[in-house]
Amino acid sequence: FGISGKHFITVTTFTSAGNIGEDGTLSCTFEPDIKLNGIVIQWLKEGIKGLVHEFKEGKDDLSQQHEMFRGRTAVFADQVVVGNASLRLKNVQLTDAGTYTCYIRTSKGKGNANLEYKTGAFSMPEINVDYNASSESLRCEAPRWFPQPTVAWASQVDQGANFSEVSNTSFELNSENVTMKVVSVLYNVTINNTYSCMIENDIAKATGDIKVTDSEVKRRSQLQLLNS
């Protein structure tokens, strides 16, 4: 009893975010096939004529590639045979944001999956004690953000307190005229307390913590991509 036509294979993608000016990865996996020459990978972008990238018969073929992706894409060729169709994207641009389709054809069948790729800028904040100020204050700086984020302060001792009245935040456009440097100063800080500077936009959330005591200053920062 035969089944005519090809089977559908499972293709899995993950929503991800790209940091403009840096390199990104559009993740896609599929059911592995040991016959490399029988695997075709096509990456497409909604609203763009032509392909983002094509890999077939064990090699790249960019003859149908849209020029906005020229020289910026590659698959992890040595990992294709184990089911990795992820796309490496060089020098992420704001205009790279959108809906991508990872289309796979193998000897087992074919399948596809979409992913939403967000682009922006995000960076780790660094908090320092500002000794120049008339009263003890903290300065939180993060070099690259886009779109413009919100900035909020919190403290371990005064949980739930609103620090907007005792802080000042500014956004300075960077030289490439897209991303911005974030600077926020918190005034009237007290010793033996842990303060947090939280920077967030619709792509990422970053937190910088600083603990100031009489004898030392301890810092910690973390960055989390949202909806990934």
Partner: antibody, heavy 121, light 107 residues
Framework: QVQLQESGPGLVKPSQTLSLTCTVS??????????WSWIRQHPGKGLEWIGN???????YYNPSLRSRVTMSVDTSKNQFSLKLSSVTAADTAVYYC?????????????WGQGTLVTVSS | DIQMTQSPSTLSASVGDRVTITCRAS??????LAWYQQKPGKAPKLLIY???SLHSGVPSRFSGSGSGTEFTLTISSLQPDDFATYYC?????????FGGGTKVEIK
């Protein structure tokens, strides 16, 4: 391994068109994993990237030369070519052809040995 | 265009010396930087790609480091064959550009 060899006239008159060909041996120009570039070096000076071409014929030219440059590819002969129009003495240089490492990394290897083109009447 | 600035333009050194050449990009190029060696009358030869990856067949005394805008090429122990001119090149974005070169000469 892949080798590249430039060929073409060593002397071109001002206002004329410089024409060079790069012949690829030991590999196929139709291998989709590579872009093929032209680079030049003025006597005693640094290197200037002119542009690149893919086997399908799609090109990207350095904006500083775009109005005068044409590149083409002949997959049947395993060759790609450079034409530079309206040349002046400032176009006197050693011209190299080279292959990028991959579709995403265009560090250049291998290179041709280079050919000196002098623009003079 | 991204400007690539190399320093120094000339470097005098002796066999066995540790030599460091710097390349600065006018804007961030991530790790998309290559280093080449060129000898008189010859084509450039690729040494390092993606800032720190040693190209096949290149001696391990050559190493590259850096990311963003600041990069270095280091020759751990200069050999007689290493006296040449060295160039950096960015391939982060079109048009690709080269540094002005650093000539390593015998002291």
């Amino acid at each position: 391994q892949v080798q590249l060899q430039e060929s073409g006239p060593g002397l071109v008159k001002p206002s004329q068109t410089l024409s060079l060909t790069c012949t690829v041996s030991g590999g196929s120009i139709s291998d989709g994993s590579y872009y093929w570039s032209w680079i030049r070096q003025h006597p005693g000076k640094g290197l200037e990237w002119i542009g690149n071409i893919y086997y399908s014929g799609s090109t990207y030219y350095n904006p500083s030369l775009r109005s005068r440059v044409t590149m083409s590819v002949d997959t049947s002969k395993n060759q790609f070519s450079l034409k530079l129009s309206s040349v002046t003495a400032a176009d006197t240089a050693v011209y190299y052809c080279a292959r990028g490492l991959s579709t995403i990394d265009e560090a250049f290897d291998p290179w041709g040995q280079g050919t000196l083109v002098t623009v003079s009447s | 265009d991204i400007q690539m600035t190399q320093s120094p333009s000339t470097l005098s050194a002796s066999v066995g010396d540790r030599v460091t050449i710097t390349c600065r990009a006018s804007k961030s190029i991530s790790s998309w930087l290559a280093w080449y060696q060129q000898k008189p009358g010859k084509a450039p030869k690729l040494l390092i790609y993606e800032a720190s990856s040693l190209h096949s067949g290149v001696p391990s005394r050559f190493s590259g480091s850096g990311s963003g805008t600041e990069f270095t090429l280091t020759i751990s122990s200069l050999q007689p064959d290493d006296f040449a001119t060295y160039y950096c090149q960015q391939d982060n974005s079109y048009p690709y550009t080269f540094g002005g070169g650093t000539k390593v000469e015998i002291k």
